[in-house]
C-alpha cells in the first residue's frame, strides 16, 4: 500500500469522511486549528478535529467495539443457541415417545385400563416435560401421583372387576392403601430414582446451555468505560484529525489497549473454562440411569412389570384391601 | 401374564422399530457439542488478541499509528504506544469488572457448582438393588415378596437409543405408536423396549 499523504491543508478530506458519520458540515473546521479544547486526540500541531467530532468518534469507537465483540462470539453463540434448541426439541420427542410407548403397553396388555390410564400417563409425562424445562415440580410426587391414580383403576378393573364404576370413596382408600401396602413393590421407588436422576441431569444440562447463551449475550453488549472509549478513539480515529485515514494502529499498541478495555471481561475466563470442563464431566456421566432417553423409553416396561407384580400378588392384596377399605365398599354397595 | 406381540398396534398403526446404522444419537450429539465447546475454552482470555487480529493493525506497512503520531513499526515509539501522559492503564485494570460481568460470573460459579455436584461420583451412589444389581437385571431385593422377575413373557430386552436426527424430523402424533426408532441388538441388563 502507498505511504499516507501529508496532512490535508484544508480539512476537506477530513470533512468528507466525518460527513459519512455525521451528515452536515458544522463540526469540521475549514482549516486546521490548534485544538486546545480537545481531550482525547491531543494534537502535536494543528488539527482538523473539534470537541464535537471527538465525542462522535468516541460513540463510534464504542459501537465498533460492540460489533467486533459480536462478530468474535458469533460462531460460539450460534453453536450454543442451536444446540440448546436441538436438545430441548429432542428431549420433548423422547418424552412424547415414552408416553406413546407407555400408552401402547396399556392398550395391548390392559385394554380395560386404557381410558383412565391414558389420562394418568399423559399427566405424568406433561409433568416430566415441565420439570425438564425448569418447573418447580417434585419428581417423587409425580411418580407417586401416577401410581396413586393407577392403582384404583387396576383394583377395580383387573383385580376386582365386580365393583361398581367410579366409586370415589373406595378410590381414596385405595390410593392410601397403595402406599401403605406397597402394592407395586419397589417399582415406584425404582422409577423415582431413575426418573429423578435422569431428569435432574437433563434439566441442569439445558440450564447450563441457556446460561452459556446468557454469558455471551452479556459480553456481547458490554458498555465499555469512558476511559476505554477514549483509548479506542485515540487508537482508531485520532489519526483522522491529521488527515491520515488509512493508517493502522501498531500491533502492540492495539493489544495493550484491548487488554485494558477487556480487563473485566477476561475475568470471566477462569469460570468459563470451568463451565466447559464441568459440562463435559456431566455429559460423560449421562448414561444408564443418568440418561433420560434410556430411562424414559424403558419406563413402559417397568410400569408393565409393576402391574404384573400387583397381579401376581392379587389374591393376598384383595383380601387385605377388602378388610382395609371395607367401610368404603359397604357405602358403595348400599 | 401379559406379553408383547411381535407387532404392536395402536389405532391400527404398526409400530416399526427400524434398525439404522451409524446415525446420530443424543449422547453422540452431546459429546460432539462438548468437543466443539472445548475449542472455545480460551475464548475470553484470547478475546483481546482476537479483536486486534480481526481489526486493521499494521502488519506489512512500515508505518503505524501509536495514538499520537505515525511511527516506524518496530521503533521504540511504537512500543511505547503513545499512551504515556494519557490514561493509566493500570488504573483501568484495577477498577474491576462491570456489575453485569460480576453478576454473570456469579451465575457461572453457581452453575459450575451444580454441574460438579451432579457429576460427583458420590452423588451417584445408589442402593445396590436400584441400579447395577437391582431391577434392571431381574434380581430380587431382600424381601422375597417384592422379588421382581424379568420383563414378562415374550419380552426381549433391547437398548433403545432414539435415533437423533431421524427422530427430530419425524413428528409423531401424541397418540400414535412409537415409530422410527432403531432396533438394537438384544442385550440383557438394559432397559426394556419394544422389539420388532
Amino acid at each position: 500500500q502507498p505511504p499516507p499523504p501529508p496532512p490535508d491543508a484544508t480539512c476537506h478530506q477530513v470533512r468528507s469522511f466525518f460527513q459519512r458519520l455525521q451528515p452536515g458540515l458544522k463540526w469540521v473546521p475549514e482549516t486546521p486549528v490548534p485544538g486546545s479544547d480537545l481531550q482525547v486526540c491531543l494534537p502535536k500541531g494543528p488539527t482538523c478535529c473539534s470537541r464535537k467530532m471527538e465525542e462522535k468518534y468516541q460513540l463510534t469507537a464504542r459501537l465498533n467495539m460492540e460489533q467486533l465483540l459480536q462478530s468474535a462470539s458469533m460462531e460460539l453463540k450460534f453453536l450454543i443457541i442451536q444446540n440448546a434448541a436441538v436438545f430441548q426439541e429432542a428431549f420433548e420427542i423422547v418424552v412424547r415417545h415414552a408416553k406413546n410407548y407407555t400408552n401402547a403397553m396399556f392398550k395391548n396388555n390392559y385394554p380395560s385400563l386404557t381410558p383412565q390410564a391414558f389420562e394418568f400417563v399423559g399427566e405424568f409425562f406433561t409433568d416430566v416435560s415441565l420439570y425438564i424445562l425448569g418447573s418447580d415440580i417434585n419428581v417423587d410426587d409425580m411418580v407417586n401421583e401416577l401410581f396413586d391414580s393407577l392403582f384404583p383403576v387396576i383394583y377395580t378393573q383387573l383385580m376386582n372387576p365386580g365393583l361398581p364404576d367410579s366409586a370415589l370413596d373406595i378410590n381414596e382408600c385405595l390410593r392410601g392403601a397403595r402406599r401403605d401396602l406397597k402394592v407395586f413393590g419397589n417399582f415406584p421407588k425404582l422409577i423415582m430414582t431413575q426418573v429423578s436422576k435422569s431428569l435432574q441431569v437433563t434439566r441442569i444440562f439445558l440450564q447450563a446451555l441457556n446460561l452459556g447463551i446468557e454469558v455471551i449475550n452479556t459480553t456481547d453488549h458490554l458498555k465499555f468505560s469512558k476511559d476505554c472509549g477514549r483509548m479506542l478513539t485515540r487508537m482508531w480515529y485520532c489519526s483522522y484529525c491529521q488527515g491520515l485515514m488509512m493508517v493502522k494502529p501498531c500491533g502492540g499498541y492495539c493489544n495493550v489497549v484491548m487488554q485494558g478495555c477487556m480487563a473485566g471481561v477476561v475475568e470471566i475466563d477462569k469460570y468459563w473454562r470451568e463451565y466447559i470442563l464441568s459440562l463435559e464431566e456431566l455429559v460423560n456421566g449421562m448414561y444408564r440411569i443418568y440418561d433420560m432417553e434410556n430411562v424414559l423409553l424403558g419406563l413402559f416396561s417397568t410400569i408393565h412389570d409393576s402391574i404384573q407384580y400387583v397381579q401376581k400378588n392379587a389374591g393376598k392384596l384383595t383380601t387385605t384391601i377388602g378388610k382395609l377399605c371395607a367401610h368404603s365398599q359397604q357405602r358403595q354397595y348400599r | 401374564s401379559a406379553y408383547y406381540p411381535e407387532d404392536l398396534f395402536i389405532d391400527k398403526k404398526v409400530l416399526k422399530v427400524a434398525h439404522v446404522e451409524h446415525e446420530e444419537t443424543l449422547s453422540s450429539r452431546r459429546r460432539e457439542l462438548i468437543q466443539k465447546l472445548k475449542s472455545f475454552i480460551s475464548f475470553y482470555s484470547a478475546l483481546p488478541g482476537y479483536i486486534c487480529s480481526h481489526s486493521p493493525v499494521a502488519e506489512n506497512d512500515t508505518l503505524c499509528w501509536n495514538g499520537q503520531e505515525l511511527v516506524e513499526r518496530y521503533s521504540q515509539k511504537a512500543a511505547r504506544n503513545g499512551m504515556k501522559n494519557q490514561f493509566n492503564l493500570h488504573e483501568l485494570k484495577m477498577k474491576g469488572p462491570e456489575p453485569v460481568v460480576s453478576q454473570i460470573i456469579d451465575k457461572l460459579k453457581h452453575i459450575n457448582q451444580l454441574l460438579r455436584t451432579m457429576s460427583m461420583p458420590k452423588g451417584r451412589v445408589l442402593d445396590k438393588n436400584l441400579d447395577e444389581e437391582g431391577f434392571e437385571s431381574g434380581d430380587c431385593g431382600d424381601d422375597e415378596d417384592e422379588c421382581i422377575g424379568g420383563s414378562g413373557d415374550g419380552m426381549i430386552k433391547v437398548k433403545n437409543q432414539l435415533r437423533f436426527l431421524a427422530e427430530l424430523a419425524y413428528d409423531l402424533d401424541v397418540d400414535d405408536a412409537p415409530g422410527n426408532s432403531q432396533q438394537a441388538t438384544p442385550k440383557d441388563n438394559e432397559i426394556s423396549t419394544f422389539h420388532n
Partner: antibody, heavy 118, light 105 residues
Amino acid sequence: EVQLVQSGAEVKKPGSSVKVSCKASGGTFSSYAISWVRQAPGQGLEWMGGIIPIFGTANYAQKFQGRVTITADKSTSTAYMELSSLRSEDTAVYYCAREWQQQLVPLGYMDVWGKGTT
Amino acid sequence: ETTLTQSPGTLSLSPGERATLSCRASHSVSSNFLAWYQQKPGQAPRLLIYAASSRTTGVPDRFSGSGSGTDFTLTISRLEPEDSAVYYCQQYGYSPLYTFGQGTK
C-alpha cells in the same frame, strides 16, 4: 460471503416515486455502509448517496438532495432507496453496493454490488 | 468540485497486448482514495484496484494501478479476451463525496 439482493424492475409514471430494496446476507449488516449508484442507459456511473445502518445516517449527492431518501432496516438487513418526483431522465439501472470500511468509517471503495434494479 | 476525466474513450487492442488507461483529476486526489472498476455488459461493476495500486482478492496480477496527485493509470499487461469491458476510475473524499470518471471502453 456477503451478497446483496435487489428488488425487481419497476415501471413508473413521471411525478411518482419508486422505492428500491437491497437485502444483505452474510457478514454484519449493521456495520456495513451501503451506497446507491445509478447508471442511465449507455452512460457512466453516478453516486446518489449512502447510509451506515448502525448510525442510521445518510449522505446524499448534491444533485439528488431533497429527492432521494436512503434508509435501512437492521432487523431485516435491508437498505432502501426512494426517489421521488420521477422524470424520464431517471430511467436507469440502480445499484446498491457495500462500501469497504475501517472501524465503521467508509473508505469509499465499493467491493460488493447488487445485480441492479431497472 | 472534483471531476475525473478518463482517456481514451475507447481502446481497441488484441489479446496479449498491453493496455494503458488514464484517469485525470481536476484537483489533487489522495492516492489512498482512488479506485478502478471493471464493468461488463449487463453486469454490475466489479472493484479491481483500490488505494490507486492495491489489487482486490481474485483480481489477476496482469492488472496494476499507479499514479498520485492528479494522474492515475490502470495497466493491463497482457490482454485476455475476457478483459473486454468498460473501466471506470472513482475518487472518494472530495465534494461530491464519490465521483466516477466517464469510463474507457
